[in-house]
């Protein structure tokens, strides 16, 4: 969380941003809130990106003002216009690109004053893994697959029964470049698995950490997956 305050001149207002990550090819949110104003026409929101010649987005007098928007953001940005009056200056960024990563500034002017706060936006690819029993294999084998990751993640296997065990000798991980030549499909195979145990396939890069669990018993297979974004700090 980053909390910024206004500078000289008028009074300062508090602006708060939260560091976040974007999944390339999908839509992302750059979060920013501020002390609200009574009149929408008195609110100016400017989103800037460090090292970019034009604006990322500008909202003033109740509508978008995009005459000085940088071409790399053209047609890809929107504020939540109906929420600006309550102090939400968050920006929706469509079709996140790898090059969208960087430092952004949320700059606010209201009748009360000015304020700004920066946020770090990371971009990459992350997806939920799915763990399945590989019935084609000669021995009991688990296969963990996740369709889109970038940068290249690490994959670690763990088991509930053998806690702390190192499975690197009995597993094999491969990374296959997807058709757009950026993201990769992650496939990890774990050999010699035992029945009545819960195994976890953990995939992690500097943006996200995802876990796929599988519990194999005589009678059933239970699966569970979850994904967590790393380093979501507010400013």
């Amino acid at each position: 969380l980053i909390i910024g305050f206004g500078i000289s001149g008028r009074h300062s207002i508090t602006v708060t941003t939260v560091a976040s990550a974007g999944n390339i090819g999908e839509d992302g949110i750059l979060s920013c809130t501020f002390e609200p104003d009574i009149k929408l026409s008195d609110i100016v929101i400017q989103w800037l990106k460090e090292g970019v010649l034009g604006l990322v987005h500008e909202f003033k007098e109740g509508k978008d003002e995009l005459s000085e928007q940088d071409e790399m953001f053209r047609g890809r940005t929107a504020v939540f216009a109906d929420q600006v009056i309550v102090g939400n200056a968050s920006l929706r960024l469509k079709n996140v690109q790898l090059t969208d990563a960087g430092t952004y500034k949320c700059y606010i002017i209201t009748s009360k004053g000015k304020g700004n706060a920066n946020l770090e936006y990371k971009t990459g690819a992350f997806s939920m893994p799915e763990v399945n029993v590989d019935y084609n294999a000669s021995s009991e084998t688990l296969r963990c697959e996740a369709p889109r990751w970038f940068p290249q993640p690490t994959v670690v296997w763990a088991s509930q029964v053998d806690q702390g065990a190192n499975f690197s000798e009995v597993s094999n991980t491969s990374f296959e470049l997807n058709s757009e030549n950026v993201t990769m499909k992650v496939v990890s195979v774990l050999y010699n698995v035992t029945i009545n145990n819960t195994y976890s396939c953990m995939i992690e890069n500097d943006i996200a950490k995802a876990t796929g669990d599988i519990k194999v018993t005589e009678s059933e297979i239970k699966r569970r997956s979850h994904l967590q974004l790393l380093n979501s700090k507010a400013s």
Partner: antibody, heavy 122, light 107 residues
Framework: EVQLLESGGGLVQPGGSLRLSCAAS????????MSWVRQAPGKGLEWVSA????????YYADSVKGRFTISRDNSKNTLYLQMNSLRAEDTAVYYC???????????????WGQGTLVTVSS | DIQMTQSPSSLSASVGDRVTITCRAS??????LAWHQQKPGKAPKLLIY???SLESGVPSRFSGSGSGTDFTLTISSLQPEDFATYYC?????????FGQGTKVEIK
């Protein structure tokens, strides 16, 4: 201390190609857009091209669009200008300059290299 | 692209004179205007940015004013080291356009 050092200039025939480099030091290179500016002998300054800090946006003067390509390698703190289909009128001293950090806030063109001479002649 | 026109293209002045150079943009560039000084054989040097903000280390005899389409660079009392060529530059659009330059010579 901020330093910008251009290299790669020289004599080239019309229609030929050349790649200029600009090695930067003394500042966080990826935080700044960078520009190339040229000056023909005895003439004024002409902005040629710019690139955003992350390399996601590139901008060109009409006179070089389609012939020149600007790029950067932030891991090497280096800016490039690939010049193809060169013409006699491209003859100039080429300067790299540090461009803007934040739109509307920061100074720009506050540091320049010493320049590298490109001569296009048969 | 925004076109920048400087006037005069050259002027002769004496040490101690007050010198004014004007720059006109073909369309509004808000306050996104810089002034640079260049001496023969040297790289340009930034004097003024955002129309009127003095770059660090530049003497206070240099000042800039204006917004929109009309801008002015003033040297309040010309010094021997000020004889050079001065360029205005807009950065209100993605392109960065320079004026044609004003050469300040010794009278």
């Amino acid at each position: 201390e901020v330093q910008l050092l251009e290299s790669g200039g020289g004599l080239v025939q019309p229609g030929g190609s050349l790649r200029l480099s600009c090695a930067a030091s003394g500042f966080t290179f990826s935080s700044y857009a960078m520009s190339w500016v040229r000056q023909a002998p005895g003439k004024g300054l002409e902005w040629v091209s710019a690139i955003s800090g992350g390399g996601g946006s590139t901008y060109y003067a009409d006179s070089v669009k389609g012939r020149f390509t600007i790029s950067r390698d932030n891991s090497k703190n280096t800016l490039y200008l690939q010049m193809n289909s060169l013409r006699a009128e491209d003859t100039a001293v080429y300067y790299c300059a540090r461009d803007i950090q934040w739109y509307g806030e920061s100074t720009l063109f506050d540091y320049w290299g010493q320049g590298t001479l490109v001569t296009v002649s048969s | 692209d925004i076109q920048m026109t400087q006037s005069p293209s050259s002027l002769s002045a004496s040490v101690g004179d007050r010198v004014t150079i004007t720059c006109r943009a073909s369309q509004s560039t808000r306050s996104w205007l810089a002034w640079h000084q260049q001496k023969p054989g040297k790289a340009p040097k930034l004097l003024i940015y955002k129309a009127s903000s003095l770059e660090s280390g530049v003497p206070s005899r240099f000042s800039g004013s204006g917004s929109g389409t009309d801008f002015t660079l003033t040297i309040s009392s010309l010094q021997p080291e000020d004889f050079a060529t001065y360029y205005c530059q807009q950065y209100g659009s993605y392109s960065r356009t320079f004026g044609q330059g004003t050469k300040v010579e010794i009278k």
